[in-house]
Amino acid sequence: QPPPPPPDATCHQVRSFFQRLQPGLKWVPETPVPGSDLQVCLPKGPTCCSRKMEEKYQLTARLNMEQLLQSASMELKFLIIQNAAVFQEAFEIVVRHAKNYTNAMFKNNYPSLTPQAFEFVGEFFTDVSLYILGSDINVDDMVNELFDSLFPVIYTQLMNPGLPDSALDINECLRGARRDLKVFGNFPKLIMTQVSKSLQVTRIFLQALNLGIEVINTTDHLKFSKDCGRMLTRMWYCSYCQGLMMVKPCGGYCNVVMQGCMAGVVEIDKYWREYILSLEELVNGMYRIYDMENVLLGLFSTIHDSIQYVQKNAGKLTTTIGKLCAHSQQRQYR
Amino acid sequence: SAYYPEDLFIDKKVLKVAHVEHEETLSSRRRELIQKLKSFISFYSALPGYICSHSPVAENDTLCWNGQELVERYSQKAARNGMKNQFNLHELKMKGPEPVVSQIIDKLKHINQLLRTMSMPKGRVLDKNLDEEGFESGDCGDDEDECIGGSGDGMIKVKNQLRFLAELAYDLDVDDAPGNSQQATPKDNEISTFHNLGNVH
């Protein structure tokens, strides 16, 4: 084993190195000292370190470690943050276009239903946006609401346009009749299925990306323990105390220290792997009714078909509703 | 046949969209993200090694520091001696993760559970047969693409993609311009949505 080179007789080199960390030289001994008060850089002979220097080294070592960790995760963090923002914006654009297609369908095919239809369509797509962003809305309620609101307008404007204004009080009865008589056939149920499946997947996709950011942020800002600080100080700075300024830590030794310092962080590994693989599986399944773009941009057409379904059965429905709601109207005025 | 929403309240002059060589869809964007994420699948297990390789470590030198003394790089002491009688490394590992790490692991477990629940096998079908009442027209079978478009002559197929263009093409908003409707017929009888969302590399 080669003998260690003799320590710097004046601690001059150590002083100039330490000055970069801590301007003000009062903590560096002029000449090597026994260093009996040292707790980390335990000397085998005279040392150029003091207790204060050791504390400063520990602080610096932990800061270095935090910076290294942050630079290690920078690319990954940027990737997820950027994509989370891009997808959120993209989904918002899809919702906005879907709303416009639906409004355009009403304007072109059923001008008499606007502007009420615009209002109901706007509220429906606002709910869609809120749902995607994590609000606790029930999709079936959203769809029911859309059809509940549309039917009274369809009935009074399209099916029975001759109704006097006083008859508008039957709106509540019409809302009830909409469900009881299944006036839109199975279209509401179809839309519920498609919308709920596609939005659930979209929402969880965004949630997963946002959690990815949270995971990186958490490990990015970890505060390392005192034990870890001591290990890092010993590895990176204790050689300075012996005047060995240019010497570097052994590779195997560094790995052992890092594994010790990062034992807790590395426990995330198993769940992180599973996260990426599960996200991949989800993405592979985002097609057809599990693809909100496909579903929402086609909604205008399904809604159009549902109104055509009502119109096709208008004769039968008008008779039934005439009886049903005339009675409820009388009851209200009693 | 129905008059479908080709009238999308667009100013015609905005529709002059340059030919796009590379058409990027939302689904291709998702797959691209997954491929990039997969290159980080070993991120946490590789962290100790990454940090060592990005901090000063003896690579070509004959001698290196083992925490206590200068040793030859390939000797047994290179990894071991520095840890002796200093403190118990095993003890440090046994302490377990910090509370914040435990919390984030719990959140990961939860999202993984949700992701697995949502990721059903390929060829998924609707939970119930949706034509149990029997539609008279525009019937829908289970999980048919045609369902999401209905029926009718001259039906406009909705193109299943959000294109990412180098230039902002158009942004539709009925709320903003209910009055100025312009006739605009999407190419090939398709409705496509366009928006500029810069590439992430």
Epitope: E119, I137, D141, N144 | -
Partner: antibody, heavy 121, light 111 residues
Framework: QVQLQESGGGLVQPGRSLRLSCAAS????????MHWVRQAPGKGLEWVSA????????YYADSVKGRFTISRDNSKNTLYLQMNSLRAEDTAVYYC??????????????WGQGTLVTVSS | QSALTQPPSASGSPGQSVTISCTGT?????????VSWYQQYPGKAPKLLIY???NRPSGVPDRFSGSKSGTSASLAITGLQAEDGADYYC??????????FGGGTKVTVLG
């Protein structure tokens, strides 16, 4: 016409319970979200709780979460508010309100006349 | 959830205009969420004046109008009348779908 009628208010000691009811008529009850809103004497309106039309989703203000429970019986057209562990600061007129919408809170287009709850020893 | 911010009072002479502001945050007024306005006379239940930021229910005079921009909303009363003297509340909901009210503004019609 559309009407809401609250009942069940009164004087109650701190820590005790009370159940408010709201009978609805003149509209399709199950199609709309319903709310409880309160107003302490001389103060502004404070939202307490909401329930969606189907009853599947419930929402609470932080000040009552864990103590109050909202529920509805669509077959009886009735809304309820079960108030447990009552405190002096819960003293207020409690209004039952119908939402314009069914899926969640939006705007309250019909209000009851209110029932006074006084929590005092 | 914190309340929306309204001025405590506003006043004007008959025939004049009064505007009441209502400020929230990006998670309530500033989000996708709609703002509503209510009028309340002492000892009475509130009455809906505006919903969906700017829509008037039937029966509400067109002297009342609402608007929303960013994280603020406002209620304008033009051609002020004696019966407009009342308390006015704005209301929205946050991203958790919990309702938030403003603190209320007392409108006084002078003279």
């Amino acid at each position: 016409q559309v009407q809401l009628q609250e009942s069940g208010g009164g004087l109650v000691q701190p820590g005790r319970s009370l159940r408010l009811s709201c009978a609805a008529s003149g509209f399709t009850f199950s199609s709309y979200a319903m709310h409880w809103v309160r107003q302490a004497p001389g103060k502004g309106l404070e939202w307490v709780s909401a329930i969606s039309g189907s009853g599947g989703s419930t929402y609470y203000a932080d000040s009552v979460k864990g103590r109050f429970t909202i529920s509805r019986d669509n077959s009886k057209n009735t809304l309820y508010l079960q108030m447990n562990s009552l405190r002096a600061e819960d003293t207020a007129v409690y209004y039952c309100a119908k939402d314009r919408r069914g899926s969640h809170a939006d705007a309250f287009d019909v209000w009851g006349q209110g029932t006074l709850v006084t929590v005092s020893s | 959830q914190s309340a929306l911010t309204q001025p405590p009072s506003a006043s004007g002479s008959p025939g004049q205009s009064v505007t009441i502001s209502c400020t929230g945050t990006s998670s309530d007024v500033g989000g996708y969420n709609y703002v509503s306005w209510y009028q309340q006379y002492p000892g009475k239940a509130p009455k809906l004046l505006i919903y969906g930021n700017s829509n008037r229910p039937s029966g509400v005079p067109d002297r009342f109008s609402g608007s929303k921009s960013g994280t603020s909303a406002s209620l304008a009363i033009t051609g002020l009348q004696a019966e407009d003297g009342a308390d006015y509340y704005c209301q929205s909901y946050d991203s958790s779908l919990r309702v938030v009210f403003g603190g209320g503004t007392k409108v006084t019609v002078l003279g």
